[in-house]
């Protein structure tokens, strides 16, 4: 049976924690109901006990949404691209970045043309 | 940051539905959570329901599921509540508020709602 | 739905004085839990976000602890600009609610 609070005071006794960033609450089963949180406050970190309401319509799976631009040019120094994507929905209580920026590495093909560029460039 | 603006007062003859609204300046008003909330005077703050304006998902207080009426207009970034056959019991300070649980929230000055014949 | 019990009501204090504001959730609701103050005539301000998350632009005095179901409100040396009423609000579940208020007054 899970306790209410499992706290691990990774600070040491008497160590003030003035501000936790606590993460989304992540249901024990299925995709509603009771499960926990983590929380972190510098070295410390602690586990909650918590609900999420199954009267919330799931009608999006992941806490954050975004609207995605599309995918710019490949970098042929570090072999990736990247996109923007701003926050289209969240869940009422998930703090999600407004913006995020997410790489992937190039295809093969890409990387090829982006590399066929540079040398040209140096001539 | 977010501004909401309300009109200051409204004026409504009973059983006359009345339609609300808070426009939003600045930044991304089609990203959060509008939430209406009422307040009779003196007295404590009563949630109404919110709406996503990215998709119009709605989410209602079943207290007021025959008297509000949300939506919103994403072309000129304004949230609407319409209230159907007002009494005098529905005259109250409604607030708007755009809630994000990153950054908080803002909110709207507040429309005082008085319904009177 | 989830009750809000506030208390005390009404606080009479003395500018410099701190003091704590109580919440008591009818059940749990993790850290699901905001602080608002509202002056007359004002709308609601929010003060502490998710039990004890500080709010940009509020003055460090004031700050919030708690999970399940207590919650505390903390003003460190009141000021005469933080008189009103403070409202706490749950957003575990639907419908979101609001607590009654305590009323912090001049003593």
């Known amino acids: 049976v899970a306790k209410k609070k499992d706290k691990v005071k990774k600070g040491g006794p008497g160590s003030e924690c003035a501000e936790w960033a606590w993460g989304p609450c992540t249901p024990s089963s299925k995709d509603c109901g009771v499960g926990f949180r983590e929380g972190t406050c510098g070295a410390q970190t602690q586990r909650i006990r918590c609900r999420v309401p199954c009267n919330w319509k799931k009608e999006f799976g992941a806490d954050c949404k975004y609207k995605f631009e599309n995918w710019g040019a490949c970098d042929g120094g570090t072999g990736t691209k990247v996109r923007q994507g701003t926050l289209k929905k969240a869940r009422y209580n998930a703090q999600c970045q407004e913006t995020i920026r997410v790489t992937k590495p190039c295809t093969p093909k890409t990387k090829a043309k982006a590399k066929a560029k540079k040398g040209k460039g140096k001539d | 940051q977010v501004q909401l603006q309300q009109p200051g007062a409204e004026l409504v003859r009973p059983g006359h539905s009345v339609k609300l609204s808070c426009k939003a300046s600045g930044q991304s008003f089609s990203s959060y959570w509008m939430n209406w909330v009422r307040q009779r005077p003196g007295q404590g703050l009563e949630w109404i329901g919110m709406i996503h304006p990215s998709d119009s998902e709605t989410i209602l207080n079943q207290k007021f599921k025959d008297k509000a009426t949300l939506t919103v207009d994403i072309s000129s970034n304004t949230a609407y509540m319409q209230l159907s056959s007002p009494t005098s019991e529905d005259s109250a300070v409604y607030f708007c508020?755009?809630?994000?649980?990153?950054?908080?929230?803002?909110w709207g000055q507040g429309t005082t709602l008085t319904v009177s014949s | 739905d989830i009750v809000l019990t506030q208390s005390p009501a009404t606080l009479s204090v003395t500018p410099g004085d701190s003091v704590n504001l109580s919440c008591r959730a009818s059940e749990s609701i993790s850290n699901n839990l905001h602080w608002y103050q509202q002056k007359s005539h004002e709308s609601p301000r929010l003060l502490i976000k998710y039990a004890s998350q500080s709010i940009s632009g509020i003055p460090s005095r004031f700050s919030g602890s708690g999970s399940g179901t207590d919650f505390n409100l903390s003003v460190n040396s009141v000021e005469t600009e933080d008189f009103g009423m403070y409202f706490c609000q749950q957003s575990n579940s639907w419908p979101l609610t609001f607590g009654a208020g305590t009323k912090l007054e001049l003593k």
């Open positions: 508020s755009s809630w994000s649980a990153k950054r908080g929230d803002f």
